[in-house]
């Protein structure tokens, strides 16, 4: 049994940081084999990770972490059975993917204007909570073409858009995804999206 | 037409309170941030406070944080600044503003009160 | 927190004139950035925002830039109604510091 493709790992500057790898053939990860992992610091416990299948011969496993800070360096070993198939070490702040946003809303109760709102993925306490900017995509439902990216690089979570930048009387779509350039993370997942119909009337002309 | 009314500015002693009031018209009050900023006799703008949309985060200019809070009532389409321990370097008249525009270039503040002057002397 | 410097304090003009105002940020911002003008006795009004854009009604004449982290209001020929109190401000994060102020005066 060998390591094909070694462990790369990324955080999400809180509680998790997720490893994936993959083996040599097909593997039943979680009979077979053991992820740990140790915070380089004194008196620091040893934690085991079972791992679960991710494809034929991938694995993934899920480190459950203490608050993250960006000095924290973990060693990791890849056990099967008493077997060492690989040891290395990762620093959660250099590789970081945040949390997807969430509660991403549509306000559509002023006919000229559309409010779209979500929710910062994590607690006030947290160093990324004041670093995150987003991308909101908004696309529509019947014209694939139709298909734009706003990149919202202030604090407040919420972007304003006038209705008439978009077609009226259709469906459109939006989902949105966070980064901070602090960490120069990657893209978190994107949120779930969210459909509303845009029924944007031209102001009336008074002739 | 976007209109902003602040009210509330007095004379006050050292150490008393004093709650500033802005009256928002004329558009979607609950989708805009607004802003407290203040400006000293014959001195520069100071920005002082923000409050988000829907109240739920506020941010403080360190000359005030902990003493000043900001909190609005979108359903009375009003923020207020409540200012308690108040100096004499306090002593501004108090603007109120929007966090306005459409777009990711929303950031600035489009749409200023006429402000209310605070005095704080013994 | 961001810190803004912003040259000259002062500065005295010719009706014709091409005058320029320069902010000093103390750290890399994105380009939320805004100037604003103020008459004596009025309210500050909005002339520049994300760096470059001018608001609706501000006449051409007035121009935004940056070059890292120097942002420059140029009035490419002053008029009458130009000399006012100009402030820089930064929305990057919080606090939103203005700077100090340029007061625009005739020569």
């Known amino acids: 049994m060998k390591v094909l493709q070694e462990p790369t790992c990324v955080s999400d500057y809180m509680s998790i940081s997720t490893c994936e790898w993959k083996m040599n053939g097909p593997t039943n990860c979680s009979t077979e084999l053991r992820l740990l992992y140790q915070l380089v610091f004194l008196l620091s416990e040893a934690h085991t990770c079972i791992p679960e299948n991710n494809g034929g011969a991938g694995c993934v496993c899920h480190l459950l972490m203490d608050d993250v800070v960006s000095a924290d360096n973990y060693t990791l070993d890849l056990w099967a059975g008493q077997q060492l198939l690989w040891k290395g070490s990762f620093k959660p702040s250099e590789h970081v993917k945040p949390r997807a946003p969430g509660n991403l809303t549509v306000h559509t109760n002023v006919s000229d204007t559309l409010l779209l709102t979500w929710s910062n993925p994590y607690p006030p306490d947290n160093y990324l909570y004041n670093h995150l900017t987003y991308a909101v995509n908004i696309w529509s439902e019947n014209d694939p073409a139709d298909f734009r990216i706003y990149n919202v690089t202030y604090l407040e979570p919420s972007l304003r858009i006038a209705a008439s930048t978009l077609k009226s009387g259709i469906s459109y779509r939006a989902r949105v995804r966070a980064w901070a350039q602090c960490y120069n993370t990657t893209w978190s997942e994107w949120s779930p999206s969210t459909k509303w119909h845009n029924s944007y009337r031209e102001p009336f002309e008074q002739h | 037409q976007v209109h902003l009314v602040e009210s509330g500015g007095d004379v006050v002693q050292p150490g008393r309170s004093l709650r500033l009031s802005c009256a928002a018209s004329g558009f979607t009050f609950s989708y805009y941030g607004m802003h407290w900023v203040r400006q000293a006799p014959f001195k520069g703008l100071e920005w002082v406070a923000v409050i988000w949309y829907d109240g739920s985060n506020k941010y403080y200019a360190d000359s005030v944080k902990g003493r000043f809070t900001i909190t609005r009532d979108n359903s009375k389409n009003t923020v207020y600044l409540q200012m308690n321990s108040l100096r004499a370097e306090d002593t501004a008249i108090y603007y109120c503003?929007?966090?306005?525009?459409?777009?990711?270039?929303?950031?600035?503040?489009?749409?200023w009160g006429q402000g209310t002057l605070v005095t704080v002397s013994s | 927190d961001i810190q803004l410097t912003q040259s000259p304090s002062l500065l005295s003009a010719s009706v014709g004139d091409r005058v320029t105002i320069t902010c000093w940020a103390s750290q890399d911002i994105a380009g939320h950035f805004a100037w604003y003008q103020q008459k004596p006795g009025t309210v500050p009004k909005l002339l520049i925002y994300?760096?470059?854009t001018l608001d609706s009604g501000v006449p051409s004449r007035f121009s935004g830039s940056r070059s890292g982290t120097e942002f420059t209001l140029t009035i490419s020929s002053l008029q009458p109604e130009d000399f006012a109190t100009y402030y820089c401000q930064h929305l990057n994060s919080y606090p939103y510091t203005f700077g100090q102020g340029t007061k625009l005066e005739i020569k």
């Open positions: 994300a760096i470059s």
């Open positions: 503003a929007r966090w306005g525009g459409f777009g990711v270039t929303g950031t600035h503040l489009d749409y």
